[in-house]
Amino acid sequence: KKEDGESTAPTARPKVLRCKCHHHCPEDSVNNICSTDGYCFTMIEEDDSGTPVVTSGCLGLEGSDFQCRDTPIPHQRRSIECCTERNECNKDLHPTLPPLKDRDFVDGPIHHKHHHHHHHHH
């Protein structure tokens, strides 16, 4: 989701934005700070064992509107928040995992729990 009532259409900013990065630091980052023409983000998602993992970093302007919209993805628990209002603004973002929605699928007499599959979109 966008913070601070930003419009959904991304517009070119006149200056570079610095963001905190964790688990998502590009090669051109320094001291866990990355640079972008787009947004800072913080994301929480489940890893393959169901443990919540927090990731933060930079999103380039190109495609960031889609990334930050946080459209629910079937079978994937994750949430992302984006910001641009100041450097390292993503230090103050604390997204939470959406509520667990376990669906039981009936296949004959046996009940199968549907497993979550995890896809990374960066």
Epitope: P14, K15, E27, C34, G60, E62, N87
Partner: antibody, heavy 116, light 112 residues
Framework: QVQLQQPGAEVVRPGASLKLSCKAS????????MQWIKQRPGQGLEWIGE????????MYNQKFKGKATLTVDTSSSTAYMQLSSLTSEDSAVYFC?????????WGQGTTLTVSS | DVVMTQTPLSLPVSLGDQASISCRSS???????????LHWYLQKPGQSPNLLIY???NRFSGVPDRFSGSGSGTDFTLKISRVEAEDLGVYFC?????????FGSGTKLEIK
């Protein structure tokens, strides 16, 4: 038009500190970073660091940490660089420069002479 | 730190000639956003540098079209198609992809 005004020259004694100024006009001061760059004859250009006037966020070249401190006064659209414990190695021309994703405008530079 | 190597150090030309300056970086200047932050400046004696080309090939406002920039990754070139007297001075390449930002050592364009 964009202008960055710097004093022409400063002379100080070794061991002293000095605060260089850079007054910006012709644009919204908080919309761009301000960088500081050092030039010594025959030694090219060296990036000292930068400050974002919108939130006072700074980035430094490791080489100049402890030597340079960057600040701004948004009410007067002025950027400052404090240089401490000056030696002859600090004698140089110091430029302030406006930065978005690249430097597009430079001040005229302040020539600093450190001499006893 | 990224080392920017400029060649030649000195470039004697006749007015009207084409001039070409090379700039090589010690690592790729392609930023994680996909942009390449390689720029060219001209510094005339006693003056501050002036921006000519930004992001490899974009001419800054007011810069004549005889100036052009090209290249990618680690290898970049500035070309002046027909050198005029006002073009004389020291040309610097600069990168703002990696902190600390760094500059080439300069190429002095002078009359042959």
């Amino acid at each position: 038009q964009v202008q960055l005004q710097q004093p022409g020259a400063e002379v100080v004694r070794p061991g002293a500190s000095l605060k260089l100024s850079c007054k910006a006009s012709g644009y919204t001061f908080t919309s761009y970073w301000m960088q500081w760059i050092k030039q010594r004859p025959g030694q090219g250009l060296e990036w000292i660091g930068e400050i974002d006037p919108s939130d006072n966020y700074t980035m430094y070249n490791q080489k100049f940490k402890g030597k340079a401190t960057l600040t701004v006064d948004t009410s007067s659209s002025t950027a400052y660089m404090q240089l401490s414990s000056l030696t002859s190695e600090d004698s140089a021309v110091y430029f302030c420069a406006r930065f978005g994703f690249y430097v597009d405008y430079w001040g005229q530079g302040t020539t600093l002479t450190v001499s006893s | 730190d990224v080392v920017m190597t400029q060649t030649p150090l000195s470039l004697p030309v006749s007015l009207g000639d084409q001039a070409s300056i090379s700039c090589r970086s010690s690592q790729s200047l392609v930023h994680s956003t996909g942009n390449t932050y390689l720029h060219w400046y001209l510094q005339k004696p006693g003056q501050s540098p002036n921006l000519l080309i930004y992001k490899v090939s974009n001419r800054f406002s007011g810069v004549p079209d005889r100036f052009s920039g090209s290249g990618s990754g680690t290898d970049f070139t500035l070309k002046i198609s027909r050198v005029e007297a006002e073009d004389l001075g020291v040309y610097f390449c600069s990168q703002s992809t990696h902190v600390p930002f760094t500059f080439g050592s300069g190429t002095k364009l002078e009359i042959k």
